[in-house]
Amino acid sequence: DSEEDEEHTIITDTELPPLKLMHSFCAFKADDGPCKAIMKRFFFNIFTRQCEEFIYGGCEGNQNRFESLEECKKMCTRDNANRIIKTTLQQEKPDFCFLEEDPGICRGYITRYFYNNQTKQCERFKYGGCLGNMNNFETLEECKNICEDGPNGFQVDNYGTQLNAVNNSLTPQSTKVPSLFEFHGPSWCLTPADRGLCRANENRFYYNSVIGKCRPFKYSGCGGNENNFTSKQECLRACKKGFIQRISKGGLIKTKRKRKKQRVKIAYEEIFVKNM
């Protein structure tokens, strides 16, 4: 694929300020492109702050795509763990505070708050109920605590992140996972089933992170969240692989799973919900 192809691709992503990342393309969403090949590639996920695997279609897409995990880390995670710890200690804003408000593509019209980097204040906006980005808070206070500066130029409160000793990944402290498991998959797999805001009754599956299994639920046809899959297989492919089972205090063993050579759909890009 050529640079020209990337340049021609119409993307819908907002970008983080270049100074916050080694390269601005590290902030692009994984883009599998308009083709249908099944190629294992890696991208930098700004929300988990890790390089992660995705399936690339083989053409176009964008520059946040690497042949190997090492190449991705080299391009996008220079001293990443250290930088994040330092960020928390120095009370700088998390990168997502600089994302533009994004209501997503649904029609829920829920009142939420986002940090407006132009005005340097948290402001109200209408969230559609699905997709969007992490610059999205349920309360004004939460937004201020995480993104606004205090009177001394520091944040009002720390954004609590903990360094995971297993693979130097960062997970929000609020993530509730049974102690028997550690989760290293997409963050939406940890969210509860959400049937959404409409009146349909569509058969869908969600990942139940408490029991570590994909379970059916009835989806209303719009809204909801990204923990929403059209088949059990798709659900398992996206979420099951993220769990590592702890068999003793020291040892880690990956849960067994058969890998099917099928397109892995990236939930936040593939769930296309709207009333027609």
Partner: antibody, heavy 117, light 107 residues
């Protein structure tokens, strides 16, 4: 809810100019790529032009390159199509459409442009 | 330029299955998307990425894409499905449309 409303169409003589507008609401306009697609009377859909939302890149079909210009005003949530040196074959209904990934998920109702002497 | 070829018209009786094809050299590699357009209205996406149905689109609409041909299938066709249908793909940053197929529901 997402709404796209086109305006600015009308009757114009060959060689003349026209500016179409597309007023967008119900979504964060500035982060989406947008396109113009046209449909001549009794004919099929023809892509005209696209832009890339938060970036400045613009793209045109060969049939309009050098004559049409796509632009946007994010503060007004509006997409524009400046059409110069109009020809009879430009007569069509012009639709504004939002690009989601690699397809068009929302369309306006269209505005009719007639090029005739 | 890149061509997506559709039959100009397809006829079907109510309750029967309608199949509309779209052929193009790059379809084995690229996704196809389908739009329905009723007279005097804007197009509406009915299938995206070969076989995905947006919410609000009836289950009788389905799609497939194999070889050089993408197919839109409407099972149990209803009178309200009478419309023009267009396939669309994306090649080197440019969207391309098929010529369109007029679906007539007989009777």
């Amino acid at each position: 809810q997402v709404q796209l409303v086109e305006s600015g169409g009308g009757l114009v003589q060959p060689g003349g100019s026209l500016r179409l507008s597309c007023a967008a609401s119900g979504f964060t306009f500035r982060v989406y790529g947008m396109s113009w697609v046209r449909q001549a009377p009794g004919k099929g859909l023809e892509w005209v032009s696209s832009d890339r939302g938060s970036r400045s890149s613009t793209y045109y079909a060969d049939s309009v390159k050098g004559r049409f210009t796509i632009s946007r005003d994010n503060s007004k949530n509006t997409l524009y199509l400046q059409m110069n040196s109009l020809r009879a074959e430009d007569t069509a209904v012009y639709y504004c459409a939002r690009v989601y990934r690699y397809w068009f998920d929302y369309w306006g109702q269209g505005t009719l442009v007639t090029v005739s002497s | 330029s890149y061509e997506l070829t559709q039959p100009p018209s397809v006829s079907v009786s109510p309750g029967q299955t309608a199949r509309i094809t779209c052929s193009g050299d790059n379809l084995p590699k690229y996704y196809a998307h389908w739009y329905q357009q009723k007279p005097g209205q804007a197009p509406v996406v009915v299938i995206f990425r070969d076989s995905n149905r947006p919410s609000g689109i009836p289950e009788r609409f389905s799609g497939s894409n194999s070889g050089n041909t993408a197919t839109l299938t409407i099972s149990g066709t209803q009178a309200m499905d009478e419309a023009d249908y267009y396939c669309q793909s994306w090649l080197s940053g440019t969207p391309w449309f098929g010529g369109g197929t007029k679906l007539t529901v007989l009777g």
